[in-house]
C-alpha cells in the first residue's frame, strides 16, 4: 500500500468501546477485562484531502479486513456504515471522498468529522449497546468525543 | 519547539559498531503519530535512509543496510539510538537524526548532524 | 524496488521559475516531499504531501505530483534559492525513499 497506517482502538468520551454488530455494524458498550479482546481494531490511514494544523484527513479500515466505515445518503440522510472494499486496491493515497473523516484533535480528545458530509461526525449514544452512527450535532445528547489507543503491529 | 540533538563517538574502526543516540527537547519521543528517523549523507553525497522507529517499538530499516541497524528508545531519556554494526569506511558520513509526522510523509525537524568517520 | 531519479543540476536566472523533477514508477500513487540543503547544514522540509508547505516556507515553493513525475517549483527565484534539493517519498515495501539531489544554481 502506497499510505502509512496505524493501529488502533478507540473509545468515546464515556470509555465505551467499539464491537462489531453483525457483519456491517459497530456498536459501542462498556467491555472490561477479557471483554477487551471483542473490541474492532482500526487501521487508521492517513490519506490526501484537506489538512489544516489541526484536521488530518483519515480512512477508517477494520484491521486485516477489508471493510471501511463510509459516508452515504440514506434516505437524504448522511448515514455512517461499513462499506466492503477490494483489498488489492485499498488503502490508497487518493481514497473516495465517502471514506475519508478529518481527525480533529482538541484537548487530547478526538473527532471524526465526515469530509463528505462537513459537520457530520462519528457519534454514539448514551445508551449502552447502541449503533455507532453519523451525528450532525455536536455538544448534545449524543458523544462526539473519542479517545484512540495505539495498537502494535 | 521541538529539538533534536545527535551524540556518538565521532571516530569508529573498522568492523566494529557505530552507535549514536538522539536526544529529544520540546516533545516526547513516546508521543503517538510520528516516526523518529536516521539518515545520513557521506561527503559530497546524497540523503541515504537508515531506518526509524515508531510507538517505542515498531520498526522499518533500509534493506540494505537491514542486517547492521538496530534502532531503539529510551523513553526514560527521550531518546532513540542508532547502532550500525561491522562498519566499513564506506559508512564514514554525517548523520542525522529527524522527525517525520505519519501525515506528512515528511521529516519537519532534523538535526544538526554529526560527522562520523570510519577509521584504522 | 522502489527508486526516485532526479536531475543532477538545474541552472535558472534571478527571477525566473525553476522547475525540479522527481520521477519514480506510479509516483503519483505515492506521497511526495521535497527538502531544501545549504552547504553545512542540515536539509530543510519545503514541501510535504506533494503540495503542502510548512508553516515559514514562502508561496513561491510549491509542489505537484502525478504520473510517473513530482515537480518542485520555485517562481521569483533568489540567489538564496541556490542549494542542494531532494525529493523523498514513502513506499511500504521499500519505506522511505530520496531522489539523489539537484543542485539548483542561481546564474
Known amino acids: 500500500a502506497p499510505v502509512r497506517s496505524l493501529n488502533c482502538t478507540l473509545r468515546d468520551s464515556q470509555q465505551k468501546s467499539l464491537v462489531m454488530s453483525g457483519p456491517y455494524e459497530l456498536k459501542a458498550l462498556h467491555l472490561q477485562g477479557q471483554d477487551m479482546e471483542q473490541q474492532v481494531v482500526f487501521s487508521m490511514s492517513f490519506v490526501q484531502g484537506e489538512e489544516s494544523n489541526d484536521k488530518i484527513p483519515v480512512a477508517l479500515g477494520l484491521k486485516e479486513k477489508n471493510l471501511y466505515l463510509s459516508c452515504v445518503l440514506k434516505d437524504d440522510k448522511p448515514t455512517l456504515q461499513l462499506e466492503s472494499v477490494d483489498p488489492k486496491n485499498y488503502p490508497k493515497k487518493k481514497m473516495e471522498k465517502r471514506f475519508v473523516f478529518n481527525k480533529i484533535e482538541i484537548n487530547n480528545k478526538l473527532e471524526f468529522e465526515s469530509a463528505q458530509f462537513p459537520n457530520w461526525y462519528i457519534s454514539t449514544s448514551q445508551a449502552e449497546n447502541m449503533p455507532v452512527f453519523l451525528g450532525g450535532t455536536k455538544g448534545g445528547q449524543d458523544i462526539t468525543d473519542f479517545t484512540m489507543q495505539f495498537v502494535s503491529s | 519547539q521541538v529539538q533534536l540533538q545527535e551524540s556518538g563517538p565521532g571516530l569508529v574502526k573498522p568492523s566494529e559498531t557505530l552507535s549514536l543516540t538522539c536526544t529529544v527537547s520540546?516533545?516526547?519521543?513516546?508521543?503517538?503519530?510520528?516516526?523518529w528517523s536516521w539518515v545520513r549523507q557521506p561527503p559530497g553525497k546524497g540523503l541515504e535512509w537508515i531506518g526509524c522507529?515508531?510507538?517505542?517499538?515498531?520498526?522499518n530499516y533500509n534493506p540494505s543496510l537491514k542486517s547492521r541497524v538496530t534502532i531503539s528508545v529510551d523513553t526514560s531519556k527521550n531518546q532513540f539510538s542508532l547502532k550500525l554494526s561491522s562498519v566499513t569506511a564506506a559508512d564514514t558520513a554525517v548523520y542525522y537524526c529527524?522527525?517525520?509526522?505519519?501525515?506528512?510523509?515528511?521529516?519537519?525537524?532534523w538535526g544538526q548532524g554529526t560527522t562520523v568517520t570510519v577509521s584504522s | 524496488s522502489f527508486e526516485l531519479t532526479q536531475p543532477p543540476s538545474v541552472s535558472v536566472s534571478p527571477g525566473q521559475t525553476a522547475s525540479i523533477t522527481c520521477s519514480g514508477d506510479?509516483?503519483?500513487?505515492?506521497?511526495a516531499c521535497w527538502y531544501q540543503q545549504k552547504p553545512g547544514q542540515s536539509p530543510v522540509l519545503v514541501i510535504y504531501q506533494d503540495t503542502k508547505r510548512p508553516s515559514g516556507i514562502p508561496e513561491r515553493i510549491s509542489g505537484s505530483n502525478s504520473g510517473n513525475t513530482a515537480t518542485l517549483t520555485i517562481s521569483g527565484t533568489q540567489a538564496m534559492d541556490e542549494a542542494d534539493y531532494y525529493c523523498?517519498?514513502?513506499?511500504?515495501?521499500?519505506?522511505?525513499?530520496f531522489g539523489g539531489g539537484t543542485k539548483l544554481t542561481v546564474l
Open positions: 522507529i515508531y510507538f517505542s517499538e515498531s520498526t
Open positions: 520540546g516533545g516526547s519521543v513516546s508521543s503517538g503519530g510520528y516516526y
Open positions: 529527524a522527525r517525520d509526522p505519519m501525515h506528512y510523509y515528511g521529516m519537519d525537524v
Open positions: 523523498q517519498a514513502w513506499d511500504s515495501s521499500t519505506y522511505v525513499v
Open positions: 506510479k509516483l503519483g500513487d505515492k506521497f
